[in-house]
């Protein structure tokens, strides 16, 4: 806490500029008007203030806006954002995607901090749903964001937002999350033609039921083994040898290398040996 002291004669700040870096903490407190700071926040980032000086500037804004900063100030916080606590951020009402992007940029390349996590939560909750533009932005900065949501939270994501999802955004999702996302993806991509549809739906297939896998097997999709290995075991087990052969196409030979791993192992054990022999891979049921 900086003591309240009178501003020395001639030191009253008329604008936020580089001359302020030579001010001591108490001089900043006494000589910089909080309202001036708020209107010229965009200048702060261009000035090499010390962390201690930034603390003073934050303190001034806190006094001016005890109920939380307005978005006009938040948008221009820049590095001062790193000084905010999650409790500060909880008071904010951030509605502009541009503001969100500006603050995420400050933290770019770092792990998601508690401040950033709180900011994202406040923003998404304020929007009322995880729309496509928001998801696009969040996954660009944090590819793991989608898989950090619970299955219940994912259930509230509109199918239209699924267009923003890239394969790498689903890397850390578990089967229960894919169970929720797959039907949304199926709905989102339903008007695409066969080959384009498969390219889009492929990353979500860990949530696909047996009947959808059977349907795909009729479309010459040539699913790769990496995708096949991520399918639900209970969805793979009822597939016939002929259906798996059609589903995998030229990749069917890869079954041999995966014969000891689920779901391939369990599927092999469910098949008649005569049927397995038709593949010519030496698979033993």
């Amino acid at each position: 806490e900086v003591e309240k002291t009178a501003c020395p004669s001639g030191k009253k700040a008329r604008e936020i500029d580089e001359s302020l870096i030579f001010y001591k903490k108490w001089e900043l407190e006494a000589c910089v008007d909080a309202a001036l700071l708020a209107t010229q926040m965009d200048r702060v980032n261009a000035i090499p203030f010390t962390y201690e000086q930034l603390d003073v500037l934050k303190h001034k804004l806190d006094e001016l806006y005890p109920q939380g900063y307005p978005e006009s100030v938040i948008q221009h916080l820049g590095y001062l954002f790193l000084k905010m606590s999650p409790e500060d951020i909880r008071k904010w009402n951030v509605t502009s995607l541009e503001t969100l992007k500006a603050l995420l940029e400050v933290n770019k390349g770092h792990e998601m901090s508690p401040q950033v996590a709180t900011l994202i939560d406040r923003f998404v909750k304020g929007r009322g749903q995880l729309d496509k533009d928001t998801l696009d932005t969040l996954t660009a900065f944090y590819p793991g964001y989608l898989c950090s949501l619970s299955p219940e939270e994912l259930s509230s994501v509109p199918p239209s937002s699924i267009w923003a999802v890239r394969p790498q955004d689903l890397d850390t999702c578990d089967p229960r999350q894919l169970d929720v996302l797959y039907p949304k993806a199926r709905l989102a991509f339903q008007n695409m033609n066969g080959s384009e549809y498969f390219v889009k739906i492929q990353s979500f297939l860990g949530g696909a039921p047996t009947e959808d896998l059977k349907a795909l097997s009729q479309q010459n999709v040539s699913m790769d083994l990496a995708t096949f290995m991520k399918l639900r075991t209970d969805a793979v087990l009822p597939l016939t040898v002929a259906e798996v052969q059609k589903l995998l196409g030229p990749h069917v030979e890869g079954l041999k290398a995966e014969e000891r791993h689920r779901p391939v192992r369990d599927w092999i054990l469910r098949q008649r040996q005569d049927d397995l022999d038709t593949l010519g891979l030496g698979l033993q049921g």
């Epitope: 999650p86 409790e87 909750k125 749903q129 898989c147 619970s150 299955p151 219940e152 939270e153 509230s156």
Partner: nanobody, 123 residues
């Protein structure tokens, strides 16, 4: 360390109403109520996600229980209407700061618990 302060609960006739409240000492990602009836598992009843603005309700309470919250006070309210004898249980406020993707009703993912408040509904 998140502290949870519960209030509300008590005894009521079937068809009556009660309101529970729970205040968290700091920001949490999920806050809500679980309940445990004698000889039964602890189950999620109504849980608010502060991450995405989604509220979970157990099927058995949908249309009867409603969550509301006061952001400024970090307080969550559970309005319980049309109470039934089978709603009798100890109600626990629970909170977590969780971004693992764990289910909202997975009680093992909640690391902060209130002491519990008894709700008794007689027929």
């Amino acid at each position: 360390e998140v502290q949870l302060a519960e209030s509300g609960g008590g005894s009521v006739q079937a068809g009556g109403s009660l309101t529970l409240s729970c205040t968290a000492s700091e920001y949490v990602t999920h806050l809500g109520w679980f309940r445990q009836a004698p000889g039964k598992e602890r189950e999620g009843v109504a849980i608010e996600s502060f991450r995405i603005g989604y509220t979970y309700y157990a099927d058995s309470v949908k249309g009867r229980f409603t969550i509301s919250h006061d952001n400024a006070k970090n307080t969550l309210y559970l309005q319980m209407n049309s109470l039934k004898p089978e709603d009798t249980a100890i109600y626990y406020c629970a909170a977590r700061q969780d971004r693992s993707g764990a289910s909202m009703v997975n009680r093992d993912s909640y690391n902060y618990w209130g002491k519990g408040t008894q709700v008794t509904v007689s027929s």
